[in-house]
């Protein structure tokens, strides 16, 4: 594959990363799946300066981002070390709340409506964000 | 547990606008996670989304009944209500508050669900 | 006429497996997650699947749900009296930009 160089059309570039912001809701392994196809993954947040940039664009709307604990701990989905990483979860969160009553737990990460993080039943039509980097190597085959 | 209950007038007069309370107790209505919305049953008949308004007021209607509804919240009361202005015979049925676990702009699934008002309009 | 299609009724004996189908299209069903309701006689309908396949708890592991392309459909094994009741589907609808129901299955337990 070749280096992408420039982010695709309707895609915000910053920080050497490229962003997508969707406008209707999925659920969180339906939006992964989507991201995926698009050759990204859901948004991965390493810093306070990209949750600002992330939060800025989605404004105050429940969005899910590449974070999830289904196989027991906490993994960001490219691989990221969560234990070392940015964190920004509202208070008492993560709960993993059993509570809603619509069996098992919470389990996928989400930006609230302030930008801190809560774990929600994974299920749940939010939107969501994928994030590519401009500096790997895309799948798509060279131009000649 | 989250419990919702309907509460308004039985009888409405034909023309005249139908006006109803969903109290939410059990849970806070500006948690944010949820919307709530208003559902109505004719007798005998299937379920008809009206609309759901979310705790900072936004609001989606179906686009039927649109010209007529209006949803507000009172987050300091812990519910929101329903108004249904020139109504006719063809608004009479049971009216159901329910908790929609959809994100910003989509529905999720409906639950709970209030017990449900009968409103029959008539003269 | 509602946007989903459901059978007006459907029946069988205990024991049996009954399943209640629900026809939609790529704006509704074809697009997003469907869920199952169930309204026993003389009271509110309650959530008995959400997001195609997923159970409430307290919901028996006898309903299951499943969805492929714009239909989805409902399927009760080991199907008791208690079961009798209206069964409604509902999705998003793109359309409509907002949730939409099917007519209802009335099911009977001979």
């Known amino acids: 594959g070749s280096e992408r160089t420039c982010c695709p059309v309707n895609w915000v570039e910053h920080e050497r990363s490229c962003y997508w912001f969707s406008r209707s809701g999925k659920a969180w392994a339906d939006a992964d799946n989507y991201c995926r196809l698009e050759d990204a993954h859901l948004v991965v947040v390493t810093s306070w300066e990209e949750q600002k940039f992330v939060q800025h664009h989605i404004g105050p709307v429940n969005t899910w981002m590449g974070l999830h604990d289904q196989n027991g701990p906490w993994k960001w989905v490219d691989g990221t070390d969560y234990e070392t990483g940015f964190k920004n979860w509202r208070p008492e969160q993560p709960d993993d709340w059993y509570g809603h009553g619509l069996g098992g737990g919470e389990d996928c990460a989400h930006f609230t409506d302030d930008g801190r993080w809560n774990d929600d039943v994974c299920q749940r039509p939010y939107r969501w964000v994928c994030e590519t980097e401009l500096d790997k190597a895309s799948q798509e085959p060279p131009l000649l | 547990q989250v419990q919702l209950q309907e509460s308004g007038p039985g009888l409405v007069n034909p023309s005249q606008t139908l006006s109803l309370t969903c109290a939410v107790s059990g849970g806070s209505i500006s948690s944010g996670y949820y919307h709530w919305s208003w559902i109505r049953q004719h007798p005998g008949k299937g379920l008809e989304w009206i609309g759901y308004i979310y705790y900072s007021g936004s609001t989606y209607y179906n686009p039927s009944l649109k010209s007529r509804v209006t949803i507000s919240v009172d987050t300091s009361k812990n519910q929101f209500s329903l108004k249904l202005t020139s109504v006719t015979a063809a608004d009479t049925a049971v009216y159901y508050c329910?908790?929609?676990?959809?994100?910003?702009?989509?529905?999720?699934?409906?639950?709970?669900w209030g017990q449900g008002t009968l409103v029959t309009v008539s003269s | 006429q509602s946007v989903l299609t459901q059978p007006p009724s459907a029946s069988g004996t205990p024991g049996q497996r009954v399943t209640i189908s629900c026809s939609g299209s790529s704006s509704n069903i074809g697009s997003y997650a469907v869920n199952w309701y169930q309204q026993l006689p003389g009271t509110a309908p309650k959530l008995l699947i959400y997001?195609?396949?997923h159970r409430p708890s307290g919901v028996p592991d006898r309903f299951s749900g499943s969805k492929s392309g714009t239909s989805a459909s409902l399927a009760i094994s080991g199907l008791q009296s208690e079961d009798e009741a209206d069964y409604y589907c509902?999705?998003?609808?793109?359309?409509?930009?907002?949730?939409?129901f099917g007519g209802g299955t009335k099911l009977t337990v001979l």
């Open positions: 997001s195609n396949n």
């Open positions: 329910a908790r929609d676990w959809g994100g910003y702009d989509s529905s999720g699934w409906f639950d709970p």
């Open positions: 509902e999705a998003w609808d793109d359309s409509l930009n907002g949730p939409v």
